[in-house]
């Protein structure tokens, strides 16, 4: 019936932990891809869309080789926190047009939140230094028009897709070094 009191709990295999994180990330990447297709289908918008408040893409795939696990996880968590905030903002601020993307957008938010908790757990299991709590981010500016909101949605989902794609490749590469 469990280890005797005071004895250290058996630490799960970090590679298995990383595997399940990759699985979650892959699943979220697919959710994001599907939602992006839905958004483009319902609200076509040509060209690239940028949002100044979004994080810049962490790293090109080619530069992944030089990365270390702590820096990847730290950066990934920070970027995904930003995307979570943007998805929450999107769901509350964007008007009835984007309500047609529910419940998928809500599911995306829930799964993004779950991935963030998983990353936090992974960082503690790997005994990585815990980050101080993030300073409160400035509130996101309201869209000036519905169209501005739609463009923001394209930018958020497009950026999240790229970030998750980078994350899957980065985590798989780092797993080989554990």
């Amino acid at each position: 019936p469990g280890p005797p009191p005071g004895s250290p709990r058996a630490s799960p295999d970090p590679r298995a932990e990383l595997d399940s994180t990759v699985l979650l990330t892959r699943s979220l990447l697919e959710d994001t891809r599907q939602l992006t297709i839905q958004l483009k289908d319902k609200f076509p918008a040509d060209g690239d869309h940028n949002l100044d408040s979004l994080p810049t893409l962490a790293m090109s795939a080619g530069a992944l080789g030089a990365l270390q696990l702590p820096s990847v996880l730290t950066r990934l968590r920070a970027d995904l926190l930003s995307y979570l905030r943007h998805v929450q903002w999107l769901r509350r601020a964007m008007g009835s047009s984007l309500k047609t993307l529910e419940p998928e957008l809500g599911t995306l938010q829930t799964r993004l939140d779950r991935l963030l908790r998983r990353l936090q757990l992974l960082m503690s299991r790997l005994a990585l230094p815990q980050l101080p709590p993030d300073p409160p981010a400035p509130p996101l500016a309201p869209p000036s028009s519905t169209w501005g909101g739609i463009r923001a949605a394209h930018a958020i989902l497009g950026g999240l897709h790229l970030t998750l794609d980078w994350a899957v490749r980065g985590l798989l590469l780092l797993k080989t070094r554990l």
């Epitope: 601020a93 008007g95 047609t100 028009s145 519905t146 169209w147």
Partner: antibody, heavy 117, light 111 residues
Framework: QVQLVESGGGVVQPGRSLRLSCAAS????????MHWVRQAPGKGLEWVAV????????FYADSVKGRFTISRDNSKNTLYLQMNSLRAEDTAVYYC??????????WGQGTLVTVSS | QSVLTQPPSASGTPGQRVTISCSGS????????VNWYQQLPGTAPKLLIY???LRPSGVPDRFSGSKSGTSASLAISGLRSEDEADYYC???????????FGGGTKLTVLG
């Protein structure tokens, strides 16, 4: 400056139809969702319907569903509300309103619809 | 019966601070932004507060909005006679797929 001007109101008998228009100017009409909101005499505000910026998505209040149709013509910068099977309880001032999200940042002056026999 | 609940009336004397409450549920105020409108007698409503606590340009900083859980409130400090009007709260409701309003609060400035 932003302007919304409603027209088409008047006195109509129960069961009849009426079409309201809202002419927009001073902004890029096709970039905004548009709503209709009404106010019965001496009563509060009641949301009626919304149409998305490009016209494909529409939502209605339960009280008008199946009777009212919201539409828009972006080439004419005009919003419409087709009201069929009118009832006495539809008597109200009807406002069109612009929205960048869920808040109405500009309102028209309103047009009065009276349903009476 | 309105989906959002507001007191039917409120009053105060010039210079005073008054607060108008707006109570809703998890499907409206709890998960969406709250807006406040002022309607002066015989005129169309005017946006006063949006995104829970933001003021459009031209609205004096005497007006402020706040939200906690499924309730919101509008505070008016330094009350003036021209503030006498009807005030409405509103939010999108996810269950109804539409905008909901409070029944409105008639503010009277005494004296």
């Amino acid at each position: 400056q932003v302007q919304l001007v409603e027209s088409g109101g008047g006195v109509v008998q129960p069961g009849r139809s009426l079409r309201l228009s809202c002419a927009a100017s001073g902004f890029t009409f096709s970039h905004y969702d548009m709503h209709w909101v009404r106010q019965a005499p001496g009563k509060g505000l009641e949301w009626v319907a919304v149409i998305s910026y490009e016209g494909s998505n529409k939502f209605y209040a339960d009280s008008v569903k199946g009777r009212f149709t919201i539409s828009r013509d972006n080439s004419k910068n005009t919003l419409y509300l087709q009201m069929n099977s009118l009832r006495a309880e539809d008597t109200a001032v009807y406002y069109c309103a612009r929205t960048p999200g869920f808040h109405f940042d500009y309102w028209g002056q309103g047009t009065l619809v009276t349903v009476s026999s | 019966q309105s989906v959002l609940t507001q007191p039917p009336s409120a009053s105060g004397t010039p210079g005073q601070r008054v607060t108008i409450s707006c109570s809703g549920s998890s499907s409206n105020i709890g998960s969406n932004y709250v807006n406040w409108y002022q309607q002066l007698p015989g005129t169309a409503p005017k946006l006063l507060i949006y995104y829970d606590d933001l003021r459009p340009s031209g609205v004096p900083d005497r007006f402020s909005g706040s939200k906690s859980g499924t309730s919101a409130s509008l505070a008016i400090s330094g009350l003036r006679s021209e503030d006498e009007a009807d005030y409405y709260c509103s939010a999108w409701d996810d269950s109804l797929s539409g905008v909901v309003f409070g029944g409105g609060t008639k503010l009277t400035v005494l004296g």
